[in-house]
Amino acid sequence: PEPPTACREKQYLINSQCCSLCQPGQKLVSDCTEFTETECLPCGESEFLDTWNRETHCHQHKYCDPNLGLRVQQKGTSETDTICTCEEGWHCTSEACESCVLHRSCSPGFGVKQIATGVSDTICEPCPVGFFSNVSSAFEKCHPWTSCETKDLVVQQAGTNKTDVVCGPQDRLRA
């Protein structure tokens, strides 16, 4: 028969014959022959291959370097890489999460719209009228101004986006 020029899925062409690729988690040791199938062996400890392949070496699992603020989110297997995330209070600088930076704090006048996660930074928003934030924080939202009326008080000093209103007693002297 004519030697093949193309092979089925999960096969590769070598020496005019189709050999099976190695399954995820295994590496190629020897191509198939007319007598035996492809020889594959498992990846070692701390190694992986995540596709059907003909790689002669497995890839090393990613190292989550604590010196860069990283920790293991999901331990790697022979078929998957380790997934790193950042320590509490830090987030990844890229999708690959190769290093971490401290979560951003929202300055006075700004509140936290979305709290940071291991992979995304804090999202701040300006405090709208009627709300304020007087601290620099990675967690605090804008707080509503105090309602003097509900306390039977009057506004003595108007609030800003950074300060609360100041309430005082009602002036009882009437003209």
Partner: antibody, heavy 115, light 110 residues
Framework: QVQLVQSGAEVKKPGSSVKVSCKAS????????ISWVRQAPGQGLEWMGM????????SYAQKFQGRVTMTRDTSTSTVYMELSSLRPEDTAVYYC????????WGQGTLVTVSS | QSALTQPPSASGSPGQSVTISCTGT?????????VSWYQQHPGNAPKLIIY???KRPSGIPDRFSASKSGNTASLTVSGLQADDEADYYC??????????FGGGTKLTVL
């Protein structure tokens, strides 16, 4: 069909080294590992280690670590096994074979260590 | 790692079946489906007769079969023939790019 042809018999003095060659033909040289196995007279098979010709990476059995070196020459499709600090008990037939599975074998090389 | 354990000898009459065992540990035979069996006639290089625990290379008759249970692999030669008289060795992948052989079994056809 892969064929493995080994170098000829050797007689060595204790303390010296021996280098056995294994020339591959047929198939793609870089696409299979080569294991080395020895067999002392009247004894069983003993795996010594392997070399991956595609990258030249090696793995040696603990017993031979520090005494064995496996290399390859891709230009001649040949792998070599060198054993140093030879002793009389290293007298054996040394075989090369394809892969860990060892589905094809060389004809063997008799190494005699004697003073 | 230490050698796999095989009985030193086994025997059977022509036409009978003989089973040879190969006992390892949970780090080699028990851990991987990468057990091979070899036949070696005197003065010859070994010949692969079983790989990946139970597969036969093409050209090897189906009188040779193999299996594994736990840390023990077995080779069965059925319909024994005079030419089956030889030494038989098992080997197993032992992880970390290491391989270990059994001590060998001398099969005699009575």
């Amino acid at each position: 069909q892969v064929q493995l042809v080994q170098s000829g018999a050797e007689v060595k003095k204790p303390g010296s080294s021996v280098k056995v060659s294994c020339k591959a033909s047929g198939g793609t040289f870089s696409s299979y590992a080569i294991s080395w196995v020895r067999q002392a007279p009247g004894q069983g098979l003993e795996w010594m280690g392997m070399i991956n010709p595609s990258g030249g990476t090696t793995s040696y059995a603990q017993k031979f670590q520090g005494r064995v070196t496996m290399t390859r020459d891709t230009s001649t499709s040949t792998v070599y096994m060198e054993l140093s600090s030879l002793r009389p008990e290293d007298t054996a037939v040394y075989y090369c074979a394809r892969g860990f599975r060892m589905d094809q074998w060389g004809q063997g090389t008799l190494v005699t260590v004697s003073s | 790692q230490s050698a796999l354990t095989q009985p030193p000898s086994a025997s059977g009459s022509p036409g009978q079946s003989v089973t040879i065992s190969c006992t390892g540990t949970s780090s080699d035979v028990g851990a991987y489906n990468f057990v091979s069996w070899y036949q070696q006639h005197p003065g010859n290089a070994p010949k692969l007769i079983i790989y990946d625990t139970r597969k036969r290379p093409s050209g090897i008759p189906d009188r040779f079969s193999a299996s594994k249970s736990g840390n023990t692999a077995s080779l069965t030669v059925s319909g024994l023939q005079a030419d089956d008289e030889a030494d038989y060795y098992c080997s197993s992948y032992a992880g970390n790019n290491n391989l270990v052989f059994g001590g060998g079994t001398k099969l005699t056809v009575l």
